[in-house]
C-alpha cells in the first residue's frame, strides 16, 4: 500500500498530508487484487495533480472515487475507460479549470460532485450546467466559473453563444422488414458546436456499414437476420455540451421454424413440449396420426413462455391412455412460410399387454369433429367438450 495510504481488500484511502502522494495510488504486485477494490478515498493531497490514462484502469470493480481537498488539475480523457462500474465521483475542492464530458460519457454515474473547483467559463464546461439542469434535484451543487474578468459566475447563469446541445433526426422507412432483405437508414444532425455523428447498433447480428459525414449519415443493413427483430438502432449526435439520439426499433418478419419438438413428458399433465420461432406470430395446428387433432379441455396447446419472436409451449394432455399413443405432427405457419415436425408418443401400454410391447395403433373409427387452428396464445376451446381422442379423418370425410 503506498505511503500516506491505508489499504484493505476492497478499499484504499489516502488522507495523510505528510508525506502525501504525488501520483494516483497503485498497489504493489502480489498485494491486494486491484479488481476487488470498490472504493478509493483521497483527501488532503496537495501534490496530486494528474490522473493519467492508465492510473485507474486496474481497478475495474471501482464504484466510488473520492478526491477532495487536493491539487487535482488534469484528468486524462480515457482515465475511466475501463471503470464501467463507477457510480459516484467526488472531486470537491480541487484545482480543476476544465473537465470534458468525454471522461464520463460511457459511465452510468449516479453522482458527480464538482463543487469548489476554479472552472474557467467556456463551452468546455457547459455540459456540467446541462447535466445540473437535467437533474433538477433539490440538492443541486453551487458551481461557479471564472469569466475573462476573473469574476466568479454561477454556472446556472452561464450564457455562451454558439454553445448548445445538438440534435439528431433519424429518417427511417417502415422498419418492418422481411428476413434476408436490406434497408438503409438516414440521419441528420445539427448543433453548435458542430456535432459528431455516430450509429449505435448495439449487438446487431446483421451485416451493416455506415457512411458518415459530420452532419449527415446513412446506415445500410444487409441480409437482415431474424435474430435482430426487436433490436434498437440509434443515431447519436454528440458535441462538447452533450448528446442527442433518435432511435428506431427493427421488426423482422420471417417464416416459422419449429426449433424443438420432443416426446411427451409427465408432470402435472402430460406435455409434448415444443419451441416455435416466427414473426408475425405463427398459427399452430396439431395432427394426430395424420388427421387434424381436435383440441378440447382435455387436450390443448398452451404457450408458457414468449420471448419476443420465440414461443415455448406444450400440447397438454389430461390423463392420456393407450388410445392417445401415436404420431403427433405440429405445423406452424405465417404468411412467410411454414414448418412441420413430427414425434411419436407412447403414453401407456395396451391393457393386458406388457408395456414394452408395440401393438399397432388402435383401429378406432374416428369421427370428424375437427378443431380450429391455434393462433399462438389463443387456447380457447372452440368445439364442444368431447373426449380427447376425437380427431378428424385425414381427408376430412365422415365415415
Amino acid at each position: 500500500c503506498p505511503t500516506s495510504c491505508k489499504c484493505s481488500a476492497s478499499r484504499i484511502w489516502c488522507s495523510d498530508p505528510s508525506p502525501g502522494i504525488v501520483a494516483f495510488p497503485r498497489l504493489e504486485p502480489n498485494s491486494v487484487d486491484p479488481e476487488n477494490i470498490t472504493e478509493i478515498f483521497i483527501a488532503n493531497q496537495k501534490r496530486l495533480e494528474i490522473i493519467n490514462e492508465d492510473d485507474v484502469e486496474a481497478y475495474v470493480g471501482l464504484r466510488n472515487l473520492t478526491i477532495v481537498d487536493s491539487g487535482l488539475k488534469f484528468v486524462a480523457h480515457k482515465a475511466f475507460l475501463k471503470n464501467s462500474n463507477l457510480q459516484h465521483i467526488n472531486f470537491t475542492r480541487n484545482k480543476l479549470t476544465s473537465l470534458s464530458r468525454k471522461h464520463f460519457r460511457h459511465l452510468d454515474l449516479s453522482e458527480l460532485i464538482l463543487v469548489g473547483n476554479p472552472f474557467t467559463c467556456s463551452c468546455d464546461i457547459m455540459w456540467i450546467k446541462t447535466l445540473q439542469e437535467a437533474k433538477s434535484s433539490p440538492d443541486t451543487q453551487d458551481l461557479y466559473c471564472l469569466n475573462e474578468s476573473s469574476k466568479n459566475i454561477p454556472l446556472a447563469n452561464l450564457q455562451i453563444p454558439n454553445c448548445g446541445l445538438p440534435s439528431a433526426n433519424l429518417a427511417a422507412p417502415n422498419l418492418t422488414v422481411e428476413e434476408g432483405k436490406s434497408i438503409t437508414l438516414s440521419c441528420s444532425v445539427a448543433g453548435d458546436p458542430v456535432p459528431n455523428m455516430y450509429w449505435d447498433v448495439g449487438n446487431l447480428v446483421s451485416k451493416h456499414m455506415n457512411e458518415t459525414s459530420h452532419t449527415q449519415g446513412s446506415l445500410r443493413i444487409t441480409n437482415i437476420s431474424s435474430d435482430d427483430s426487436g433490436k434498437q438502432i440509434s443515431c447519436v449526435a454528440e458535441n462538447l455540451v452533450g448528446e442527442d439520439q433518435d432511435s428506431v426499433n427493427l421488426t423482422v418478419h420471417f417464416a416459422p421454424t419449429i426449433t424443438f419438438l420432443e416426446s411427451p413428458t409427465s408432470d402435472h399433465h402430460w406435455c409434448i413440449p415444443f419451441t416455435v420461432k416466427g414473426n408475425p406470430k405463427p398459427a399452430l395446428q396439431w395432427f394426430y396420426n395424420g388427421a387434424i387433432l381436435n383440441e378440447s379441455k382435455y387436450i390443448c396447446t398452451k404457450i408458457h413462455v414468449t420471448n419476443h419472436t420465440e414461443y415455448h409451449g406444450c400440447l397438454q394432455l389430461d390423463n392420456p391412455t393407450h388410445m392417445n399413443n401415436g404420431d403427433y405432427t405440429l405445423i406452424a405457419k405465417n404468411e412467410y412460410g411454414k414448418d412441420e415436425k413430427q414425434i411419436s408418443a407412447h403414453f401407456m401400454g395396451w391393457p393386458g399387454i406388457d408395456d414394452g410391447a408395440n401393438p399397432n395403433y388402435p383401429d378406432v373409427i374416428y369421427e370428424d369433429y375437427g378443431t380450429a387452428a391455434n393462433d399462438i396464445g389463443d387456447t380457447t376451446n372452440r368445439s364442444n367438450e368431447i373426449p380427447s381422442t376425437d380427431v378428424t379423418d385425414k381427408t376430412g370425410r365422415e365415415h
Epitope: K333, Y336, G337, Y369, A372, A373, D375, G396
Partner: antibody
Framework: DVQLVESGGGLVQPGGSRKLSCAAS????????MHWVRQAPEKGLEWVAY????????YYADTVKGRFTISRDNPKNTLFLQMTSLRSEDTALYYC????????????WGQGTSVTVSS | DVQITQSPSYLAASPGETITINCRAS??????LAWYQEKPGKTNKLLIY???TLQSGIPSRFSGSGSGTDFTLTISSLEPEDFAMYYC?????????FGAGTKLELK
C-alpha cells in the same frame, strides 16, 4: 362427401359491389381454413384470399387488398367474399377451396361462380 | 412474391406413356409445392402436396419430386382419363402462386 357450392356471381358494373357465398357440406367446416381462387377467361389460376378456421388470420392478394373482404359464418357452414370497387380485371370464375392440411394445399374445390365486370 | 414457371405449356402423349411436367420457383419454397388436375365439368383435384405426398384417393401412377426451387410431376403409364390441364402451386408462403398450366393432350 365433401361439397363446396359457390353462388352470387353475375354481371356487375365497374365500381360496383358483389358478395359471393360458398356453402360447405360433408365435413366440419369450422375445422378448416378456406381460400378463394379465381380464373380469368383463358387465363391461369390466381389466389385471392385466405381465412383460418376461427377467422384469426386473414390474407389477401395485393391485387384485391382493400377492396375484397373474406369472412365466414361457421354455424352456417358458409364462406363469403365481399367484393367492392370492382374492375374489369376482376372478371373471372371464382372458386372456393378448402385447406385440408393446414398447409395451403387446396384439397377440395367448388365448381366456381362467374363474375363479369362490364358496363 | 414467388414466381412459378411451369413447363411445358403444352404436351401431347399417348396412353401407356410416361410424362413429366416441371415447375421452377423464383426462390426456395422448401418442399411446399402442390399439383392439381383441371378437367371441364369437374372440380379441380389435388394430386400431390408438399412436393411428393400423394393425396388420398389419387392413383399411384402420379408422383411428385423435388425441393427448393425445382419440382417435377411424373405420370407413369398414362390412362385416358389423365388427359387434362395440370397446374402447380407453391404453398410455402403468401401470396400463394400458381404456374401457368400444362395442357396434356392425346397424341
Amino acid at each position: 362427401d365433401v361439397q363446396l357450392v359457390e353462388s352470387g356471381g353475375g354481371l356487375v358494373q365497374p365500381g360496383g359491389s358483389r358478395k359471393l357465398s360458398c356453402a360447405a357440406s360433408g365435413f366440419t367446416f369450422s375445422s378448416f381454413g378456406m381460400h378463394w381462387v379465381r380464373q380469368a377467361p383463358e387465363k391461369g389460376l390466381e389466389w385471392v384470399a385466405y381465412i383460418t378456421s376461427g377467422s384469426n388470420t386473414i390474407y389477401y392478394a395485393d391485387t384485391v387488398k382493400g377492396r375484397f373482404t373474406i369472412s365466414r359464418d361457421n354455424p352456417k357452414n358458409t364462406l363469403f367474399l365481399q367484393m367492392t370497387s370492382l374492375r374489369s380485371e376482376d372478371t373471372a370464375l371464382y372458386y372456393c377451396a378448402r385447406d385440408g392440411y393446414f398447409l395451403d394445399a387446396l384439397d377440395y374445390w367448388g365448381q366456381g361462380t362467374s363474375v363479369t365486370v362490364s358496363s | 412474391d414467388v414466381q412459378i414457371t411451369q413447363s411445358p405449356s403444352y404436351l401431347a402423349a399417348s396412353p401407356g406413356e410416361t410424362i413429366t411436367i416441371n415447375c421452377r420457383a423464383s426462390k426456395s419454397i422448401s418442399k411446399y409445392l402442390a399439383w392439381y388436375q383441371e378437367k371441364p365439368g369437374k372440380t379441380n383435384k389435388l394430386l400431390i402436396y408438399s412436393g411428393s405426398t400423394l393425396q388420398s384417393g389419387i392413383p399411384s401412377r402420379f408422383s411428385g419430386s423435388g425441393s427448393g426451387t425445382d419440382f417435377t410431376l411424373t405420370i407413369s403409364s398414362l390412362e385416358p382419363e389423365d388427359f387434362a390441364m395440370y397446374y402447380c402451386q407453391q404453398h410455402n408462403e403468401f401470396p400463394l402462386t400458381f404456374g401457368a398450366g400444362t395442357k396434356l393432350e392425346l397424341k
